[in-house]
């Protein structure tokens, strides 16, 4: 066959759908690879062809669009399952072509099973709610395009295994779930089950997401450097190991990049000839505030090193801060036989 622009297997779009539920999957060519949409392609005489490779097989097969009740169908650039079956799992390819042009991409589709409490291997999206921030809502995701606006589905919300009704601060409002005042106790998995009729049949869409309650922007502060501080003096003799921790607290901030770094005499450690190592550890609180510790280490410190300026810097979306460590050379204790004896008038 003639050459075809093959975008390969797009593993970035690992699509997971539940068994025995409708699924609509758009050809990724138009979403991520080509500069034109399906309508333009169709108007230009290009045809969209679908085929697949079953799980654990190498053979590409055409998709059977003649199944009973049109279980699998194609509509424009969308492949429809009404509903899915477990053995629909595999790699699906959509190819756009005519006599002079060809472009194709494959993507993995995994049909997963869920138990009666909606537990499954499905990767769950995470929705972050600010703690004690006032009314916040989550919306049942990825249900657009499954039924026309004239159809009024029924939506049932669950937290874990339990139907949400008469909860203190969580109120179902159709496609939305409202949290009056989000608290740590609201952390968990929330599931919406959307039930709608189509051609005399009833379909269910199950969507689960993880709610994580995080620090509120009302309480967010610039980074706080806990160490170094004024209470600790790093007093060392030449030859000893110098260890200075830089410990910084970062308030949770959505999409903030938290940074910690050391400078020595105003330069990054990489730009300095001294043998310095830096080890970093990160911990998080329940509301995703972050504490970063970078330990600066000089194995055998010299008297020159003890005269340098060691500064811990930190930056977040809330601002930048820095703090210098108090470093000094330890004055050696007097040797009794010489210095002290002289003081007593010994000769």
């Amino acid at each position: 066959s003639e050459r075809c622009d093959d975008w390969g297997l797009d593993t970035m779009r690992q699509i997971q759908v539940f068994e025995d539920e409708p699924a609509r999957i758009k050809c990724p060519l138009f979403e991520h690879f080509l500069k034109f949409n399906y309508s333009t392609a169709h108007s230009a005489g290009l045809t969209l062809i679908w085929y697949w490779t079953r799980q654990d097989r190498d053979l590409e097969e055409p998709i059977n669009f003649r199944l009973p009740e049109n279980r699998i169908s194609k509509e424009k650039d969308v492949l429809w399952f009404r509903p899915t079956l477990l053995n629909d799992t595999g790699n699906y390819t959509c190819m756009l072509r005519n006599t002079t042009y060809c472009s194709k991409v494959a993507f993995p589709l995994e049909v997963v099973q869920k138990d009666s409490c909606f537990n499954s291997p499905m990767k769950l999206p995470v929705h972050k709610l600010y703690i004690e921030y006032g009314i916040q809502r989550i919306t049942c995701p990825n249900v657009d395009g499954y039924f026309p606006s004239s159809v009024k589905p029924t939506i049932t919300w669950y937290m874990g295994c339990y139907k949400i009704q008469n909860f203190n601060n969580v109120i179902p409002e159709g496609m939305n779930l409202s949290f009056l005042i989000a608290l740590i106790s609201n952390n968990g998995n929330y599931t919406c089950v959307v039930t709608y009729p189509e051609n005399g049949r009833t379909f269910h869409l199950t969507r689960t997401l993880t709610v994580k309650v995080v620090g509120s922007p009302k309480n967010a502060v610039p980074p706080v450097i806990h160490s170094p501080n004024d209470h600790v003096v790093y007093e060392k003799e030449p030859g000893e190991e110098l260890l200075i921790p830089c410990t910084v607290y970062f308030s949770f901030l959505m999409d903030s990049r938290n940074e910690v770094w050391w400078t020595i005499d105003g330069k990054k450690p990489d730009d300095i000839t001294i043998d310095v190592t830096i080890n970093e550890s990160i911990s998080h609180s329940r509301t995703e505030d972050e504490t970063r510790t970078q330990i600066l280490s000089i194995k055998k410190v010299t008297s020159e090193d003890l005269k340098r300026s060691y500064v811990c810097h930190a930056r977040s979306a809330k601002g930048e801060v820095a703090k210098a460590a108090k470093v000094k050379q330890k004055v050696p204790a007097p040797r009794y036989t010489v210095e002290l004896a002289c003081g007593f008038g010994a000769t």
């Epitope: 502060v221 610039p222 004024d230 005499d265 105003g266 340098r308 300026s309 930048e320 820095a322 210098a324």
Partner: antibody, heavy 117, light 113 residues
Framework: SVEESGGRLVTPGTPLTLTCTVS????????MGWVRQAPGKGLEWIGT?????STYYASWAKGRFTVSKTSTTVDLTITSPTTEDTAIYFC???????????????WGQGTLVTVSS | DVVMTQTPASVEAAVGGTVTIMCQAS??????LAWYQQKPGQPPKLLIY???SLASGVPSRFKGSGSGTEFTLTISDLESADAATYYC???????????????FGGGTEVVVK
């Protein structure tokens, strides 16, 4: 930005309040300081107020000056001016937020106070 | 209080030359030192903090060094725009605490020929 106002000619002993108006940042995040400069002389630190409203003064300035603040202004009151208090008074913001090591990264243009009978 | 002593009071150098200003603290201030530049009729401008860290936008011709009680500001490749008075400042008090405290040196006038 940081801008001082309130400087004028006053007679000795008449209290005077200088105001520093800030914009673009929150006073709850920064230490703010007052520094003065007598004509032809060097810089002299008077006092500082932190984000929570605690105040710190140079030993010579205690009792002679009061630093206070609102949500967008920092005030310096000269309680009983003398002719030695004639100077340009600068309001300045700490370089880094939340830091008690105060080195001033942002300064106003200063306001002139003249104390004369 | 920590007393900051600057030397010399005035220094003169040619364009392209190098100037060194000294600052001595009456007791150890570790690396707790900042340097400012002030031109006539203008407020001071922060050049260096924590002894050697350059403030934003300050050229690398300005270099701070020292520790404990002895500190130096070196200006190399001197430009006519560097003519100004330079001040050192610490934020440590006599107990080695920083809590909003400040103490300035007496200043050094740099004259560029």
């Amino acid at each position: 930005s940081v801008e001082e106002s309130g400087g004028r000619l006053v007679t000795p002993g008449t209290p005077l309040t200088l105001t520093c108006t800030v914009s673009g940042f929150s006073l709850s995040d920064y230490y703010m300081g007052w520094v003065r400069q007598a004509p032809g002389k060097g810089l002299e630190w008077i006092g500082t107020i932190d984000g929570g409203g605690s105040t710190y003064y140079a030993s010579w300035a205690k009792g002679r000056f009061t630093v206070s603040k609102t949500s967008t202004t920092v005030d310096l009151t000269i309680t009983s001016p003398t002719t030695e208090d004639t100077a340009i008074y600068f309001c300045a913001r700490n370089y880094y937020a939340g830091l008690s090591d105060v080195f001033f990264g942002w300064w106003g243009q200063g306001t002139l106070v003249t104390v004369s009978s | 209080d920590v007393v900051m002593t600057q030397t010399p009071a005035s220094v003169e150098a040619a364009v392209g030359g190098t100037v060194t200003i000294m600052c001595q603290a009456s007791e150890t201030i570790y690396s707790g030192l900042a340097w400012y530049q002030q031109k006539p009729g203008q407020p001071p401008k922060l050049l260096i903090y924590y002894t050697s860290s350059l403030a934003s936008g300050v050229p690398s011709r300005f270099k701070g060094s020292g520790s404990g009680t002895e500190f130096t500001l070196t200006i190399s490749d001197l430009e006519s725009a560097d003519a100004a008075t330079y001040y050192c400042q610490t934020y440590y008090d006599s107990e080695g605490r920083s809590y909003g405290y400040n103490s300035f040196g007496g200043g050094t006038e740099v004259v560029v020929k």
